[in-house]
C-alpha cells in the first residue's frame, strides 16, 4: 500500500507472524511508529513497534500467537495501519486491507543435514518451519550450491516443483568443500514470495579412492 510518499509491505508466514516493512521518503524526525493489526473476524488485535533498518525504512513483526498456532485463514482480512506519534497523538501514515493468504512468505527451511555423501554425490534433507497444514503438498523449493571460487549469486538455481524435503546433488568434485541453501514458496497467493534462504549447510565430498578415476 502506498500513501503519500511511503511504502508499506507485509507478509504472513502462514501461522502466527506478520512481518512488515514501512519505508518513507524524506527522513522523519525521531518519532515512535507502530503497526496495528485489526482482523475483521477475530477478537484479538496486535501491535508492534517499528524499528529502523535503514535511514528511510522501518520493520517489525506482529506476533499473533505461539509459533505453530494457526491464527489466520484464507477468508480473513486484516486491516494494517502504520501509526506514528506526533505530539501526544497518533497519526495514520499508511493503511492496507491485508489478505494473509495472498501475501505469504514462509520461514526459511531449517534442520538441513547431510543424509549421505559420496565422492560425486551428496544427499541433503531439510524441514519446513511454521508452515500451515492448509498447504498440504502445495509447496515448491529452490536450492543452490556454492562451489569453490564462486559467489551465491553465480550459483545456478535448482527448482523442486513439489513438496520434496530432500535433494540429491550430483556431478560434484571429490574432496571439495561446498555449501548448500534452500528456500520455500507456497503455490497460493497473488503476492506470495520466496522465503529467505536457509542457513548454509557446509559439507565436503569424499576423496576419490587411490588408483581410481
Amino acid at each position: 500500500a502506498v500513501n503519500g510518499t511511503s511504502r508499506f509491505t507485509c507478509f504472513y508466514n502462514s501461522r502466527a507472524n506478520i512481518s512488515c516493512v514501512w519505508s518513507q521518503d524524506g527522513a522523519l524526525q525521531d518519532t515512535s511508529c507502530q503497526v496495528h493489526a485489526w482482523p475483521d473476524r477475530r477478537r484479538w488485535n496486535q501491535t508492534c513497534e517499528l524499528l529502523p533498518v535503514s535511514q528511510a525504512s522501518w520493520a517489525c513483526n506482529l506476533i499473533l500467537g505461539t509459533p505453530d498456532s494457526q491464527k489466520l485463514t484464507a477468508v480473513d482480512i486484516v486491516t494494517l495501519r502504520v501509526m506514528c506519534r506526533e505530539g501526544v497523538r497518533w497519526r495514520m501514515m499508511a493503511i492496507q486491507d491485508f489478505k494473509p493468504f495472498e501475501n505469504l512468505r514462509l520461514m526459511a527451511p531449517i534442520s538441513l543435514q547431510v543424509v549421505h555423501v559420496e565422492t560425486h554425490r551428496c544427499n541433503i534433507s531439510w524441514k519446513i518451519s511454521q508452515a500451515s497444514h492448509y498447504f498440504e503438498r502445495h509447496l515448491e523449493f529452490e536450492a543452490r550450491t556454492l562451489s569453490p571460487g564462486h559467489t551465491w549469486e553465480e550459483a545456478p538455481l535448482m527448482t523442486l516443483k513439489q513438496k520434496q524435503e530432500w535433494i540429491c546433488l550430483e556431478t560434484l568434485t571429490p574432496d571439495t568443500q561446498y555449501e548448500f541453501q534452500v528456500r520455500v514458496k507456497p503455490l497460493q497467493g497473488e503476492f506470495t514470495t520466496w522465503s529467505p534462504w536457509s542457513q548454509p549447510l557446509a559439507f565436503r565430498t569424499k576423496p576419490a579412492a587411490l588408483g581410481k578415476d
Epitope: G4, M83, V88, R91, M92
Partner: antibody, heavy 121, light 112 residues
Framework: EVQLVQSGAEVKKPGASVKVSCKAS????????ISWVRQATGQGLEWMGE????????YYNEMFKGRVTMTRDTSISTAYMELSSLRSEDTAVYYC??????????????WGQGTTVTVSS | DVVMTQSPLSLPVTLGQPASISCRSS???????????LEWYQQRPGQSPRLLIY???NRFSGVPDRFSGSGSGTDFTLKISRVEAEDVGVYYC?????????FGGGTKVEIK
C-alpha cells in the same frame, strides 16, 4: 452532549502563576486529547500544547516550554493548564478544546467557553 | 514554525452576497502521509471558536453547505456562497500538518 466547562476569570500579578481547569462531560474523558489555545485581547489564536488524559502524556509548544504545565485528574474528568512566571503579555482568554487521540481528520472539535486571565500589577 | 497568513484582515459584505477568505502557508502543508490538515474555525462575537472545515474541503457536522473550502499546497480559500447575519465573526485558518500547529491571524467578516 459534549461539554467542556472552564474555571472562572483570574487576575494575577506579574511573576505569579495561574491554573485554569477544564471539566469534560458527555464523552469518555480518557479517550480524547485536551488541547489548550490562547487568545490575547484583540489578537489571534495560539496553540499552546496538549495532554492525553489516558496516560498523562503531554506536548508543549516550544514557545511556552518551561512555563506551562498540563495535568489531569481522571477521577473528575478535569484537565488543568498552569502557566507560571506571568507577564503582561500573557493577558488573554485561555481555551481548552477536545481532539481525537488519532489525528485522522481535525485537531479540535469541541471548545470550552474560555477563561480570561488578566496579568496586572 | 509554519506561518499562516490570512487576507483580507477585514471583509465587509452585503447580506446574501458571497465572501471569500484567503489563507497562505509559509511552506507546503501536505503531511508526509499525503493528507493536508488545513482547517477553518469560526469565532462569533463573544463566543468560542467552532470547527467549520477540515482537511481543506470537508464540512464538519452541522455546518451549513454555504461554507466551502478549497486549495492545495500553500494556498487555501474559504468561501461563503451567500452571507447570512449569523456568519458575522472572525475566521481563522489552521494547519495541523507540522507541529507546532499554527493559526492564521484571522479575517473579520462584518455586514456592510
Amino acid at each position: 452532549e459534549v461539554q467542556l466547562v472552564q474555571s472562572g476569570a483570574e487576575v494575577k500579578k506579574p511573576g505569579a502563576s495561574v491554573k485554569v481547569s477544564c471539566k469534560a462531560s458527555g464523552y469518555t474523558f480518557t479517550d480524547y486529547v485536551i488541547s489548550w489555545v490562547r487568545q490575547a485581547t484583540g489578537q489571534g489564536l495560539e496553540w499552546m500544547g496538549e495532554i492525553y488524559p489516558g496516560d498523562g502524556n503531554t506536548y508543549y509548544n516550544e514557545m511556552f516550554k518551561g512555563r506551562v504545565t498540563m495535568t489531569r485528574d481522571t477521577s473528575i474528568s478535569t484537565a488543568y493548564m498552569e502557566l507560571s512566571s506571568l507577564r503582561s503579555e500573557d493577558t488573554a482568554v485561555y481555551y481548552c478544546a477536545r481532539g481525537s487521540y488519532t489525528y485522522d481528520n481535525y485537531a479540535m472539535d469541541f471548545w470550552g467557553q474560555g477563561t480570561t486571565v488578566t496579568v496586572s500589577s | 514554525d509554519v506561518v499562516m497568513t490570512q487576507s483580507p484582515l477585514s471583509l465587509p459584505v452585503t447580506l446574501g452576497q458571497p465572501a471569500s477568505i484567503s489563507c497562505r502557508s509559509s511552506q507546503n502543508i501536505v503531511h508526509s502521509n499525503g493528507n493536508t490538515y488545513l482547517e477553518w474555525y469560526q469565532q462569533r462575537p463573544g463566543q468560542s471558536p467552532r470547527l467549520l472545515i477540515y482537511k481543506v474541503s470537508n464540512r464538519f457536522s452541522g455546518v451549513p453547505d454555504r461554507f466551502s473550502g478549497s486549495g492545495s499546497g500553500t494556498d487555501f480559500t474559504l468561501k461563503i456562497s451567500r452571507v447570512e447575519a449569523e456568519d458575522v465573526g472572525v475566521y481563522y485558518c489552521f494547519q495541523g500538518s507540522h507541529i507546532p500547529w499554527t493559526f492564521g491571524g484571522g479575517t473579520k467578516v462584518e455586514i456592510k
